[in-house]
């Protein structure tokens, strides 16, 4: 990125000239390349700092900025210098500093293993119906049924590899088309992006590390959307990655591969296979309607097994219905016909917490769930602790210069690039884009990433994600081959071209403003974050989902009302921000609107009330529970018994939110609220944790 | 030792009724399924039709419904064949016999045979 | 129905020859064919089924072959016990249906 212009000699007067900024205020630009700037969150919003009047940069550029809170912060380093200590006290540091490692990367292990976990955890509460909704044999015939039960099934079972192996495996039994296979494809990616999002919740504690890590979190969501939402009407108007992927797979001979390495897998499998073990296949098996599988439990009991071909004696209803001609007969009675038949001896049980337990998948499910994201919670508060004391003073500079700064003109539209590939290559490794961009989030919230820069990285890991998937399907049987194949090609083919949409123009990145838009206004109003995830990953799917299986007229009825408002809204928007003269001047703002639905804070109100029933007794108990009553109410009075908050309600005492110029939101009403021009809501009933 | 006995000969009157058994012993009844089969003229055979004891199923061959009924009893394990508006062309020696049920192992035990003459 | 066929009303033999006896089925059984023997004032008694299995207690010299529509029963060494009539039948599909039978005499 180009640095923001300044004039080299010219020196800041030392009585601070300060004024109220009259109008609105120009986008800062990201300035963290260059500077590391204090977060100052207590800074008042709204003013801007003026040059002396010698300075001939303030007659030709515009006020300096605003105190961006997209700005990295500087992590402050309290400690002795290295200089400055006696031999035990460097051998001290020494170990101090292989303690933090080896805390580091334990609490890494176990929120990768947590990660896991949730998976199986969701796997169980929604398997069977994520199952069931790939029976749905409307999915043929409407992409966009596709397109949200691919977002479903990835959200119920929290894994895109686990919903894409379930398509590839109705496509090689003819269940489905590759074609009908794209859609859900296209929605499986939408919702594996949700685990980094539930990551970015948990530190909702401080305000402007939640702004970043949200918003670093949701880049990946406003990706996946608008690629679809460009994407999936192309695909349905004219094939292109069906033909491309069919043209590849057609001209190539491929012969089995070996199996995708498992890296990470390697080391937490022995862990992770001690909680809990499930039965994969039995999803797979609801999806291509197999009756006896909805009976059937997902936590696997038994891992050794002996199996036994045999023949049995069916009847069958005519003889035409026989499996082998010459097997065929009849006693007069019945037609009958020789099945073979796979019996399995149970020799050995697995060796996990719930293989004796006999508990329903569902209770089985919800523990795991609460448990995995207690530990997914613990592990990123100490993974952030950690990683704040050792990146201080001159660490942090080194790792965020190398991360964050550009390669040298002319060179530095390469730099993305690079992180592209390093996003890939690290999810390759990984074996899993959740993980990485999981991985990411508090590395973003912490500071240390700019959003800037982990966009390229999100890209990258999506890509990552698909060669994984290549790898996979080179590795299957012959009659899955070909499908798998195709169908891992479609979700590369659609995430490059994703990649050419949203971001070779820095003009066209509109995932980051779109997410740092979500990051002003969820760090504003927290609620609001955990109202986005579930609004973006079950409502509106499940509402489309609904709608399709009323029908098409139905689906169009309501769609096209839904879709022209929102057309107009936008267009409304751009006219207002571009040229408000050609609007008559009522429609030059959104002031005609009622207060609810131009701003959130009425919403907030309600949901404070909402709230409060829980505020008096809902979390007393420890630092994690703090948390989540923050990102619920809004409300350090909840917190009184528990002096994490109490000390933290202190420090926040009189703190609003900066924020960027308006231009990041679509509703300019929301964007005055969160800079503060609109009256904020009494600061007694804001709380921030941890 | 597996037995299939059937009961002595029938004279019979045109337009009557005749009811032949078959008691069996020596195997499980209900895992089995009884045939009848007649034989005229002392050469052709020709199945009349079958019943699975267990579930009381029955088939029959097109030309002998409504002319054969064949019924089972578990609790004698004797099954029985009714031959009804007897004709003397139904005059002929008919035979009960097993059927492993869900095998292919075909007729592997008869009963020694009922004569039955029609004649006015 | 499936008619079966055998074309042979009557098969001269002496003791200790090989004899074969056949059966056409008038469509495909695929191997769904018993062999029956009856003496004269007996039950009939099986002696092959699904075409080439021997039934428990059979001599080894009846040996049955064939599957689709030609079948045959076979028995070498011929013993004076075994001048009998020999039924085929069908048991691919209902009704069950005989052939008409194949007397074997001494010549």
């Known amino acids: 990125m180009a640095p923001w212009p300044e004039l080299g000699d010219a020196q800041p007067n030392p009585d601070k000239y300060l004024e109220g900024a009259a109008g609105q205020q120009p986008t800062a630009p990201d300035k963290s390349k260059e500077t590391n700037k204090t977060d100052n969150t207590e800074a008042p919003v709204t003013k801007i700092e003026l040059l002396p009047s010698y300075s001939t940069a303030t007659l030709i550029d515009e006020p300096t900025e605003v105190d961006d809170p997209w700005n990295l912060p500087t992590l402050q380093d309290s400690g002795i210098k290295w200089s400055e200590r006696d031999t035990k006290g460097k051998i001290l540091c020494f170990f101090q500093g292989i303690g933090r490692l080896i805390l580091l990367l334990g609490f890494l292990y176990f929120f990768v293993c947590s990660l896991d976990i949730l998976s199986s955890a969701f796997q169980l509460v929604g398997g069977k119906m994520a199952g069931q909704f790939f029976s749905n044999s409307s999915i043929m015939s409407n992409p966009l049924l596709g397109l949200v039960i691919g977002v479903l099934v990835t959200v119920l079972v929290q894994s895109s590899s686990t919903s894409t192996s379930i398509v590839v495996s109705m496509v090689s039994s003819s269940l489905l088309t590759v074609r009908a296979a794209i859609p859900i494809i296209m929605g499986a990616n939408i919702g594996t992006s949700i685990t980094n999002t539930i990551v970015a919740l948990m530190q909702v504690g401080d305000r402007s590390e939640f702004r970043r890590a949200f918003a670093g979190a949701t880049v990946h969501d406003f990706f996946n959307w608008l690629s679809v939402l460009v994407l999936l009407p192309v695909e349905v108007a004219t094939h292109y990655l069906e033909i491309i992927t069919q043209l590849i797979v057609e001209s190539f001979h491929f012969k089995n591969g070996e199996d995708a390495p498992d890296l990470l897998k390697v080391i937490t499998k022995p862990f992770t296979k001690l909680i809990v073990q499930l039965d994969k296949k039995v999803i797979s098996q609801i999806a291509m309607n197999d009756e006896k599988a909805k009976n059937k439990s997902l936590v696997k009991i038994w891992c050794k097994t002996f199996t036994n071909k045999t023949q049995i004696n069916v009847t069958v209803p005519s003889t035409a219905n026989c499996t082998s001609p010459s097997l065929c007969w009849t006693d007069g009675i019945q037609n009958w016909t020789m099945k073979n038949v796979t019996y399995k001896e149970n020799i050995a049980k697995c060796q996990h917490i719930f293989v004796n337990f006999h508990l329903p998948d569902l209770a089985v499910g919800t523990i795991l769930l609460i448990l995995s994201l207690l530990v997914l919670c613990g592990c990123l508060i100490m993974i952030v602790k950690i990683l704040g004391s050792v990146l201080k003073g001159q660490v942090a500079t080194v790792i965020k210069k190398t991360i964050n700064t550009d390669f040298p003109f002319p060179f530095a539209w390469l730099t993305g690039y690079l992180a592209i590939l390093v996003g890939a290559g690290m999810t390759f490794i990984v074996q899993s884009s959740s993980v990485f961009t999981s991985a990411l989030t508090p590395l973003i919230g912490i500071g240390v990433i700019t959003i800037e820069r982990a966009y390229p990285l999100t890209l990258g890991s999506n890509i990552g994600t698909t060669t994984t998937a290549i790898l996979a399907a080179l590795a299957s049987p012959g009659n899955a081959l070909r499908s798998s194949l195709q169908i891992a090609l479609c979700h590369f083919f659609f995430n490059i071209s994703g990649i050419l949409l949203w971001y070779p123009i820095p003009f066209t990145r509109l995932p980051i403003r779109m997410a740092k838009g979500l990051g002003n206004i969820s760090a504003k109003y927290r609620w609001f974050a955990v109202f986005y995830l579930i609004i973006f990953f079950f409502l509106i799917p499940l509402t489309v989902f609904g709608l399709s299986l009323a029908g098409w007229r139905v689906l169009v009825g309501v769609g096209v009302p839904v879709v022209f408002i929102i057309i107009l809204v936008l267009c409304l928007r751009l006219l207002q921000s571009r040229c408000p003269r050609v609007l008559p001047k009522k429609l030059q703002n959104w002031n005609f609107l009622p207060l609810w639905m131009r701003s959130l804070k009425p919403w907030d109100a309600v949901v404070s009330k909402f709230t409060g029933c829980f505020q008096m007794r809902c979390c007393c108990c420890c630092r994690v529970c703090c948390r989540a009553c923050c990102l619920l109410c809004d409300c350090p009075k909840c917190c009184r018994c528990s002096k994490c908050c109490e000390d933290l309600e202190e420090a926040q005492e009189g703190q609003d939110v900066p924020v960027k110029a308006p231009e990041t939101f679509d509703n300019i009403t929301i964007s005055r609220e969160a800079q503060g021009e609109v009256p904020a809501s009494d600061s007694k009933t804001e709380c921030t944790a941890l | 030792e597996v037995q299939l006995q059937q009961s002595g000969p029938e004279l019979v009157k045109p337009g009557t009724s005749v009811k032949i058994s078959c008691k069996t012993s020596?195997?499980?009844?209900?895992?089995?399924?009884i045939h009848w089969v007649k034989q005229s003229h002392g050469r052709s055979l020709e199945w009349i039709g079958g019943i699975i004891p267990n579930n009381d199923v029955t088939n029959y061959k097109q030309n002998f419904r409504g002319k054969a009924a064949l019924t089972a009893d578990k609790s004698s394990n004797t099954a029985y064949m009714e031959l009804r508006s007897l004709t003397s062309e139904d005059s002929a020696v008919y035979y009960c016999?097993?059927?492993?049920?869900?095998?292919?192992?075909?007729?592997?035990?008869w009963g020694q045979g009922t004569s039955v003459t029609v004649s006015s | 129905d499936i008619v079966v066929t055998q074309s042979h009303k009557f098969m001269s033999t002496s003791l200790g020859d090989r004899v074969s006896i056949t059966c056409t089925a008038s469509?495909?059984?695929?191997?769904?064919v018993a062999w029956y023997q009856q003496k004269p004032g007996h039950s009939p008694k099986l002696l092959i089924y699904w075409a080439s299995t021997r039934h428990t207690g059979v001599p080894e010299r009846f040996t049955g072959s064939g599957s689709g529509t030609d079948f045959t029963l076979t028995i070498t060494n011929v013993q004076s016990e075994d001048l009998a009539d020999y039924f085929c039948?069908?048991?691919?599909?209902?009704?069950?249906?005989f052939g008409v039978g194949t007397k074997l005499e001494l010549k």
């Open positions: 020596g195997f499980f009844f209900t895992e089995y399924i």
């Open positions: 469509q495909d059984v695929g191997t769904a």
């Open positions: 039948q069908q048991y691919r599909t209902s009704p069950l249906t």
């Open positions: 016999a097993r059927w492993r049920n869900a095998y292919y192992s075909a007729m592997d035990s």
